[in-house]
Amino acid sequence: QKYSQLLEKKTTKELVHTTLECVKKNMPVEETAWSCCPKNWKSFSSNCYFISTESASWQDSEKDCARMEAHLLVINTQEEQDFIFQNLQEESAYFVGLSDPEGQRHWQWVDQTPYNESSTFWHPREPSDPNERCVVLNFRKSPKRWGWNDVNCLGPQRSVCEMMKIHL
């Protein structure tokens, strides 16, 4: 069961999102708690995801996420990534919150999550160019898999924003 426009329940914070979609959480009888994502965002586990249809540079994409009180996607698990893949369009590429600001192949997540080489999903022979310092999720027809590719940060791409669920 979903409930929208419950913002009056949370008076302590001015929110950017005017409409939330919420599900009731299992709590002790005397408490009521809602787990919410902004309308038109996707819900998975403890996070909410916004998949853009507009293209922008990596930096502008991160700013757009920040304006929505979110950040570019940080991939923590295989399951999370698979969920995202299932909601993307094969013909597009999507910026995520992984970059190499100095071009030294020192990859950094936007939320400071440590970069773990053993939990990466690069396409074959990627990353390929130190001048390509930002990462997209894209689909390769051969061998028919989603994965990561390093690209020019200025080239406009779609993006995926992520935020923690809002609890009311």
């Epitope: 990534q81 893949f85 939990s119 999903f121 074959p124 061998p143 028919k144 898999r145 994965g147």
Partner: antibody
């Protein structure tokens, strides 16, 4: 239970077209992630992957034989077909079809988990 | 094309001993967080049978004496201890990239 069974002409002459059929049961080739490959093995030699067809009708071919190969499917009758044109004695082999589960959207998959028993094809004048 | 080179091409192992088969790829088959290398067993007159997938995962129903290891370009199939029923030809296969390719095979004989 997943099974696959190959059928073919047994013997044919050089320059003819080889038509092979793979009849399968226990899975649907309309299901996202499913695929079927053809693989051949000349007597006493190794395995050679020929072609693959995915659930969405996407196709892949071995580049060394691509101009001679055509793979297609009929999901309603649970069959996959392979045509090889202009056959030569070098095409004499046992031909296998095998299922390949490639979970769509995920990074896993792609191995041949179930194989048919194979059909022997001899090209001889 | 990624070329897979198996060694040895054939060898004999005593019953109860360890057998090790190597497969070397001409380039890395590690991508998407996985090593896309698989191992098959083939006995005369039979189709190949999947033993190991994604380098180290043992297929359901395969005895625990079979194991796989390795990453990127160098992979190993180990049978320990070898049983009489393990006499067969073993093939590695990659599907990291199209076209999918097989190794040339390793024939294992038991004495």
């Amino acid at each position: 239970q997943v099974t696959l069974k190959e059928s073919g002409p047994g013997i044919l002459q050089p320059s003819q077209t080889l038509s092979l059929t793979c009849s399968f049961s226990g899975f649907s080739l309309s299901t996202s992630g499913m695929g079927v490959s053809w693989i051949r093995q000349p007597s006493g030699k190794g395995l050679e992957w020929l072609a693959h067809i995915y659930w969405d009708d996407d196709k892949r071919y071995n580049p060394s034989l691509k101009s001679r190969l055509t793979i297609f499917k009929d999901p309603s009758s649970n069959q996959v077909f392979l045509r090889i044109t202009s056959v030569d004695t070098a095409d004499t082999a046992t031909y296998y079809c095998a299922r390949n589960s490639h979970y769509y959207g995920s990074t896993y998959g792609g191995y041949f988990d179930v194989w048919g028993a194979g059909t022997t094809v001899t090209v001889s004048s | 094309n990624i070329v897979l080179t198996q060694s040895p091409t054939s060898f004999t192992v005593s019953l109860g001993q360890r057998a090790t088969i190597s497969c070397r790829a001409s380039e890395s088959v590690h991508s998407y967080g996985n090593s896309f290398m698989h191992w098959y067993q083939q006995k005369p007159g039979q189709p190949p049978k999947l033993l190991i997938y994604l380098a180290s995962n043992v297929e359901s129903g395969v005895p625990a004496r079979f194991s796989g290891s390795g990453s990127r370009t160098d992979f190993t199939l180990t049978i320990d201890p070898v049983e009489a029923d393990d006499a067969a030809t073993y093939y590695c296969q990659q599907n990291s990239e199209d076209p999918w390719t097989f190794g040339g095979g390793t024939k294992l004989e038991i004495k």
